[in-house]
């Protein structure tokens, strides 16, 4: 056969040769020839390559900068990048998690629908009728209004989305 024009999986074409790619965790030192195999070297400390490749340089592991609220969630290897996450009370600003912002709080009248994680912000929802929230909080859900009837009391002041009902004693003259 003549020299190939296409190569198998995990190979690449160079100078009419099909050369083996370097495995994840290794970088290319020299291309194969008619007489020699591809030469690869392991990535150094704090470096990685996560695919079969012909890269001559390994990538640096991501740095989780504490000044940006970041910490290491999973330490990188020669084949994987470091995964960063945010400190408690903070979440990533993007999928790449390059910086963090403080979890937002839900204002009075709103409750927490979903508590924030290292990668997602707090999700708030308006307190529906029958529920209220009178605090700004990143954890508190909307609370149901107090049921005056179960306490043998009557509603003296109606509740809102921000305030509970005010219960009072029943008017005895109205027996």
């Amino acid at each position: 056969p003549e020299p190939p024009t296409a190569c198998r999986e995990k190979q690449y074409l160079i100078n009419s040769q099909c050369c083996s790619l370097c495995q994840p965790g290794q970088k290319l030192v020299s291309d194969c020839t008619e007489f020699t195999e591809t030469e690869c070297l392991p990535c150094g400390e704090s470096e990685f390559l996560d695919t079969w490749n012909r890269e001559t340089h390994c990538h640096q592991h991501k740095y989780c900068d504490p000044n940006l609220g970041l910490r290491v969630q999973q330490k990188g290897t020669s084949e994987t990048d470091t995964i960063c996450t945010c400190e408690e009370g903070w979440h990533c600003t993007s999928e790449a998690c390059e910086s963090c912002v403080l979890h937002r709080s839900c204002s009075p009248g709103f409750g927490v629908k979903q508590i924030a994680t290292g990668v997602s912000d707090t999700i708030c929802e308006p307190c529906p009728v029958g529920f209220f929230s009178n605090v700004s909080s990143a954890f508190e859900k909307c609370h149901p209004w107090t049921s005056c009837e179960t306490k043998d009391l009557v509603v003296q002041q109606a509740g809102t989305n921000k305030t509970d009902v005010v219960c009072g004693p029943q008017d005895r003259l109205r027996a």
């Epitope: 083996s20 020299s30 008619e34 007489f35 020699t36 195999e37």
Partner: antibody
Framework: DVQLQESGPGLVEPSQSLFLTCSVT?????????WNWIRQFPGNKLEWMGY???????NYNPSLKNRISIIRDTPKNQFFLKLNSVTTEDTAIYFC?????WGQGTSVTVSS | DAVMTQTPLSLPVSLGDQASISCRSS???????????LNWFLQRPGQSPQLLIY???NRFCGVPDRFSGSGSGTDFTLKISRVEAEDLGIYFC?????????FGGGTKLEIK
């Protein structure tokens, strides 16, 4: 086109050192490939002696023990064979080669 | 070392005939990547060896398609489909999978 050319003395005395030069044109010896010395004895038997790689490291035929050294001069794009303590058994035609391209060969006789 | 045994030693042919040369290694020439570095060379009288086939079956540039290589592991074959006058000379196999590189003893292709 890649070309290789050997040069050196045609006659060496026993126990002396043989020193041959290979001049390469058309390709840098630091780019890739192994740059080999091969010899052909009377009767046509071929023997691989060793190589210097593009990165300057070596591999030698263990049969030549500690007699062989291959070095290079990268600015001149040349590599060299030094064979110590020669005997009449080292009489041969010496080729420098990348294996796909060969020099024309230089005949070396070991004799007093 | 990988000992390369070439047969026959001499191969008398008529022009236009098919010729077949065998090369057998004392150990497998397939490396851990699944590649086999077995080469065939022709040395015409008074000339340097020239590369015909590399990696078992790949024709080197400019080599006529009447030359073909095949085989795997330890057994390899060079075939010339229709011998021409310019094909006469000595054929060598060379393995470069293992160090030291080793040659077969050669097969002389000559006119009957």
């Amino acid at each position: 086109d890649v070309q290789l050319q050997e040069s050196g003395p045609g006659l060496v005395e026993p126990s002396q050192s043989l020193f041959l030069t290979c001049s390469v044109t058309g390709y840098s010896i630091t780019t890739n490939y192994n740059w080999n010395w091969i010899r052909q004895f009377p009767g046509n038997k071929l023997e691989w002696m060793g190589y210097i790689r593009h990165d300057g490291t070596n591999n030698y035929n263990p049969s030549l023990k500690n007699r062989i050294s291959i070095i290079r001069d990268t600015p001149k794009n040349q590599f060299f064979l030094k064979l110590n303590s020669v005997t009449t058994e080292d009489t041969a035609i010496y080729f420098c080669t990348r294996l796909d391209y060969w020099g024309q060969g230089t005949s070396v006789t070991v004799s007093s | 070392d990988a000992v390369m045994t070439q047969t026959p030693l001499s191969l008398p042919v008529s022009l236009g005939d098919q010729a077949s040369i065998s090369c057998r290694s004392s150990q497998s020439l397939e490396n851990s990547y699944g590649n086999t570095f077995l080469n065939w060379f022709l040395q015409r009288p008074g000339q340097s060896p020239q590369l015909l086939i590399y990696r078992v079956s790949n024709r080197f540039c400019g080599v006529p398609d009447r030359f073909s290589g095949s085989g795997s592991g330890t057994d390899f074959t060079l075939k010339i489909s229709r011998v021409e006058a310019e094909d006469l000379g000595i054929y060598f196999c060379l393995q470069v999978t293992h160090v030291p590189y080793t040659f077969g003893g050669g097969t002389k292709l000559e006119i009957k």
